[in-house]
């Protein structure tokens, strides 16, 4: 039975040209995290594997940095980066947990972070 929950940074906003950290945290389970995949809509951005470490998709290498932890840092943000991001936790023996983050990249200098929320 899957008992864990994923806490994410929720709905966040950031300035064009700036950077943002996408962060998820798996709690309430003793399952072993074997891999975390980061996706932007239908694009694989990066993978962090317990044995192999990080793989950043070549097309994002210039603007995506691994970490902190199992999170992902997006740099040199553009308005095209606005959208949904998913952290997909592959765990043993539970299976797969998915968290969602919505990022809005703003032209203005006013960019506020949304509240944290949980996805069961």
């Amino acid at each position: 039975m899957m008992t864990g929950t994923i806490e994410t940074t929720g709905n966040i906003s950031a300035e064009k040209g700036g950077s943002i950290i996408l962060q998820c945290h798996l709690s309430s389970t003793t399952a072993q995290v074997t891999q975390v995949n980061w996706e932007q809509q239908d694009q694989l951005l990066a993978i962090c594997n317990a044995d192999l470490g990080w793989h950043i998709s070549p097309s994002f290498k210039d603007r995506v940095a691994p970490g902190p932890g199992l999170g992902l840092t997006l740099q040199s943000l553009t308005v095209n980066d606005t959208g949904e991001y998913f952290c997909i936790y592959h765990t043993y023996p539970d299976g797969t947990y998915t968290g969602r983050i919505f990022l809005e990249v703003l032209e203005s200098s006013v960019a506020e972070h949304g509240a944290r929320f949980q996805i069961p």
């Epitope: 694989l44 192999l52 793989h55």
Partner: antibody, heavy 118, light 107 residues
């Protein structure tokens, strides 16, 4: 240089058994998921089974479930496929392949031919 | 199971031609789509992984695109060594499944 070398193929009668081996070298074998993929003569590719690195979790195609067993010996850098209750439709070239991040198959062995016939 | 449908099943082309092969998944697979090249009597060779990433050592005339259910492999200028059979494969979920293959022949 990454190398995968399959062995153990041959001619076997229906209902018989074979054990395939895949000797790996040139990389840290224990860190990678591994898969078996087969190809019947003149046909396309068919995934058979996978085994994860860190958990040893195993996965099988429905066509072989209950008959085939995938395993690995990280101390020997070797992947295995135990094939029981073989059928004529299992006749194929069997390839082992490395599966980084369980997303793609980046290195393949040269294959070993299994023929099931009476 | 996720079905992968490749088209065409075969095509004839000349050296220098631009060649496009398509692959459609029966459900969304995000970008978990890989392309392989296989020559007779040889093992498959990875060309493109995660829909659009070029595998190390593969010539840049090969490119991949698409996401969700529809994907494309393009060879920008066909070379003599490119005559082979090409397969797509999804890794979104097990069982891993392959397309039926596209045989690229000399016109």
């Amino acid at each position: 240089e990454v190398q995968l070398l399959e062995s153990g193929g041959g001619l076997v009668q229906p209902g018989g058994s074979l054990r395939l081996s895949c000797a790996a070298s040139g990389f840290t074998f224990s860190s990678y998921a591994m898969s078996w993929v087969r190809q019947a003569p003149g046909k396309g590719l068919e995934w058979v089974s996978s085994i994860k690195s860190n958990t040893g979790s195993t996965y099988y195609a429905d066509s072989v479930k209950g008959r085939f067993t995938i395993s690995r010996d990280n101390s020997k850098n070797t992947l295995y496929l135990q094939m029981n209750s073989l059928r004529a439709e299992d006749t194929a070239v069997y390839y082992c392949a490395r599966e980084p991040y369980s997303v793609w198959l980046d290195y393949w062995g040269q294959g070993t031919l299994v023929t099931v016939s009476s | 199971d996720i079905q992968m449908t490749q088209s065409p099943s075969s095509l004839s082309a000349s050296v220098g031609d631009r060649v496009t092969i398509t692959c459609r998944a029966s459900q969304s697979i995000s970008s978990y789509l890989n392309w392989y090249q296989q020559k007779p009597g040889k093992a498959p060779k990875l060309l493109i992984y995660a829909a659009s990433s070029l595998q190390s050592g593969v010539p840049s005339r090969f490119s991949g695109s698409g996401s969700g259910t529809d994907f494309t492999l393009t060879i920008s200028s066909l070379q003599p060594e490119d005559f082979a059979t090409y397969y797509c494969q999804q890794s979104y979920s097990t069982p891993l499944t392959f397309g039926g293959g596209t045989k690229v022949e000399i016109k």
